[in-house]
Amino acid sequence: AVNGTSQFTCFYNSRANISCVWSQDGALQDTSCQVHAWPDRRRWNQTCELLPVSQASWACNLILGAPDSQKLTTVDIVTLRVLCREGVRWRVMAIQDFKPFENLRLMAPISLQVVHVETHRCNISWEISQASHYFERHLEFEARTLSPGHTWEEAPLLTLKQKQEWICLETLTPDTQYEFQVRVKPLQGEFTTWSPWSQPLAFRTKPAALGKDT
């Protein structure tokens, strides 16, 4: 039995990366720990070194292969273990049977760009990164726009219920600086969660033409 409260959470990016976080109350800060991945039906296994992210939390990325290679399928089950060094031996601190396509978190969308901007609207596009071809078009997106004087948390969420890698923002204020972010989630997976937000895209609406009602 492991002393204290332990939590071991991992997500698959749908291609060649499993990211894990392990938190353990009362764990020793100077102990060397790693995550070991052992698929049930593959010839390879993989290890990554857990690095501290807070007082009682460690994280690491299992790199399974080339970023766009399909290293696991929906039938695979991966045994994930947290192993910590105790003298000359490794002790199992946490273990889970991990179904990769039930625990998905995709990479943040990339390549955000302004396609067209006017006084009151702006058309923005983006791309998804390292997402499996398994999903076909069955992805959804959330987007948010940061207005002057507001925080990201206050920004209303816009939901796109299909694989649509663009958005037309309406009812914007002329000659105003905005920022825009988007995130993605597959429909597949009981424990699937949203990707991180993309890097913000800054844009400015065009000024209203003088003497004209726009």
């Epitope: 290679s69 399928t73 929906t74 039938v75 071809h133 999903f135 076909e136 597949q188």
Partner: antibody
């Protein structure tokens, strides 16, 4: 327009092998999963397996894995299903289909295979 | 192997009325449940994925619900073209398995 066109009906003797083709158009075959499903009169729909055309990996259902081989020719955008050691209970309609691993978005028209001595 | 049981085997409903088809899984499958329609002499057609998500191009009268082991396909107002066989399919445990089908016929 997505299309999956299967080869014609076959009549085979018990113990023989049948190979059905599925020619696709209207989508990128090289990043698709191609599936095969059996629909036998008394047994309903049974998933036989799939091939990932991106990397050639296959997955077979346990009930078929000893006798079925699924292949894909990316130069002609054609998937194949070969079923060996045929018996009378293999008399069925066989469908190819395209989809992610979890469900089947587009289907071929079906190929009837009759196994009879 | 997960066994999918559909009920009833045959359902007789008048055009314009509502039809409710049931599908039960032999173990918990979360929302990994999909519905198909098959007309005589044709291949099945995908209607609903993950229990409740409609496929684009499918009429809004088709809706799905349920999670865990009990699922329902509802057709709110039956049209003549809706009379067909309906199959459910699970994708929680390989091999994926289908129900035996519910035949929806004109009353």
């Amino acid at each position: 327009e997505v299309q999956l066109v299967q080869s014609g009906a076959e009549v085979k003797k018990p113990g023989a092998t049948v190979k059905i083709s599925c020619k696709v158009s209207g989508f990128n075959f090289k990043d698709s999963l191609m599936h095969w499903v059996q629909q036998a009169p008394g047994k309903g729909l049974e998933w036989m397996g799939w091939i990932d055309s991106e990397n050639g990996e296959t997955e077979y259902a346990p009930g078929f894995q000893d006798r079925v081989t699924i292949t894909a020719d990316t130069s002609t955008d054609t998937a194949y299903m070969e079923l060996s050691s045929l018996r009378s209970e293999d008399t069925a309609v066989y469908y190819c289909a395209r989809g992610g691993p979890w469900f089947l978005s587009y289907w071929g028209q079906g190929t009837t295979v009759t196994v009879s001595s | 192997e997960i066994v999918m049981t559909q009920s009833p085997a045959t359902l007789s409903v008048s055009p314009g009325e509502r039809a409710t088809l049931s599908c039960r899984a032999s173990q918990i499958i979360s929302n990994n449940l999909h519905w198909y329609q098959q007309k005589p002499g044709q291949a099945p057609r995908l209607l609903i994925i993950y229990g409740l998500q409609s496929i684009s191009g499918i009429p809004a009268r088709f809706s799905g619900s349920g999670s865990g082991t009990e699922f329902t396909l509802t057709i709110s107002s039956l049209q003549s073209e809706d009379f067909a066989v309906y199959f459910c399919q699970q994708s929680n445990n390989w091999p994926w398995t289908f129900g035996q089908g519910t035949k929806l016929e004109i009353k």
